[in-house]
Amino acid sequence: ALDAAYCFRNVQDNCCLRPLYIDFKRDLGWKWIHEPKGYNANFCAGACPYLWSSDTQHSRVLSLYNTINPEASASPCCVSQDLEPLTILYYIGKTPKIEQLSNMIVKSCKCS
Amino acid sequence: ALDAAYCFRNVQDNCCLRPLYIDFKRDLGWKWIHEPKGYNANFCAGACPYLWSSDTQHSRVLSLYNTINPEASASPCCVSQDLEPLTILYYIGKTPKIEQLSNMIVKSCKCS
């Protein structure tokens, strides 16, 4: 799997999980989240050569097409596969609230 | 929806469905499919700017991050959303077989 266990241990130009820390205030302009101040969002990036973690039959076909037609602009792209939620603390006035924001953290990637 | 109805009628640099005809023999080296000789596979391509058809909370966050940090390399990618199967005819010896190949045709796209 193209997850932290594999991608963070290997130098990989191909599609893989990349570390990305996001600071809510600085990077998103969100002042309303009290805790955490930021989080490891991660992201997916890298080339999708033939048979590299292809997600669907279409992405396998596209990847093969690209190998045979290297001048073509049609190729699969490295995107998130498994995502996890993030629990945050924010305030309604002086009252603390806990909320779970879905699909905030990328755990693994795929070529799609 | 970033589908043929929208994308094939508009000149769009952003993430959209693009037409792509694949000839099985010429483009994939597949000689085993008798009919059709090729098909409209289509593919997804184009930029994923802020709020352009974001798929998940993470892709919205990434797109916002990219807007505020334009020098960043972390950005969502244009990939297939809805896929359809393709029915093919091939031969086992002299015996014709009909098979449905899943996820062969891209019908719409998303930024993920």
């Epitope: 998103l28 302009g29 969100w30 002042k31 309303w32 924010y90 305030y91 309604i92 006035g93 002086k94 009252t95 909320e99 924001l101 | 802020y50 709020l51 909370q57 919205r60 966050v61 916002l64 807007t67 505020i68």
Partner: antibody
Framework: QVQLVQSGAEVKKPGSSVKVSCKAS????????ISWVRQAPGQGLEWMGG????????NYAQRFKGRVTITADESTSTTYMELSSLRSEDTAVYYC?????????????WGQGTLVTVSS | ETVLTQSPGTLSLSPGERATLSCRAS???????LAWYQQKPGQAPRLLIY???SRAPGIPDRFSGSGSGTDFTLTISRLEPEDFAVYYC?????????FGQGTRLEIK
């Protein structure tokens, strides 16, 4: 510079619903928090509720709960306030406003206001 | 809900004079959950002060806010002709946000 542009005046019958829009520009919509405030003719200001558009977290004044819905469409940078079961006392100017960043906060930019008249 | 009571209801002063507007909360707001607005006829409110004492961008320094707990004050040091309007205080310590009933500042 943030600009909030609201939809035009509405005349509604008692018992019906009204949906007022508020389109934001000049700032990243996904970083904004929007509140809705109303003002009856010759009266003071009354807060109805607020929303964090990117995560759809909304907070409503108890007296409007069940009657008001605040939503956001990120693709058009627009916030909507829908008020149902209208009565004559809902006749007011309805304002959207962006807060300084929190769900409950001071409001630094305001729309031009939308007059909603409820009359049979 | 937190009730805000503004006084006086109407204040009649001349340009150049000092105006002192009061806002009292029915429960403690702490030191930073109060804002002041100015509203002129046919216009939307305009934020003057937030966090009890911080001036909003572009607000002249003749406007100042003070107070904490339950008692807050808006002071206009030297009244200009354009300052005659209705002033509202607003609390955002608790939901729902509430506003005072307003103080009308009129030319004497």
């Amino acid at each position: 510079q943030v600009q909030l542009v609201q939809s035009g005046a509405e005349v509604k019958k008692p018992g019906s619903s009204v949906k007022v829009s508020c389109k934001a520009s000049g700032y990243t919509f996904s970083s904004m928090v929007i509140s809705w405030v109303r003002q009856a003719p010759g009266q003071g200001l009354e807060w109805m509720g607020g929303v964090i558009p990117i995560v759809d977290i909304a907070n409503y004044a108890q007296r409007f709960k069940g009657r008001v819905t605040i939503t956001a469409d990120e693709s058009t940078s627009t916030t909507y306030m829908e008020l149902s079961s209208l009565r004559s006392e809902d006749t007011a100017v309805y304002y959207c406003a962006s807060t300084l960043g929190l769900v409950l906060d001071a409001m630094d930019y305001w729309g031009q206001g939308t007059l909603v008249t409820v009359s049979s | 809900e937190t009730v805000l009571t503004q006084s006086p209801g109407t204040l009649s002063l001349s340009p150049g004079e000092r105006a002192t507007l009061s806002c009292r909360a029915s429960q403690s707001l702490g030191s930073s959950y109060l804002a002041w607005y100015q509203q002129k006829p046919g216009q939307a409110p305009r934020l003057l002060i937030y966090g009890a004492s911080s001036r909003a961008p572009g607000i002249p320094d003749r406007f100042s806010g003070s107070g904490s707990g339950t008692d807050f004050t808006l002071t206009i040091s030297r009244l200009e002709p354009e300052d005659f309007a209705v002033y509202y205080c607003q609390q955002y310590a608790d939901s729902p946000i509430t506003f005072g009933q307003g103080t009308r500042l009129e030319i004497k």
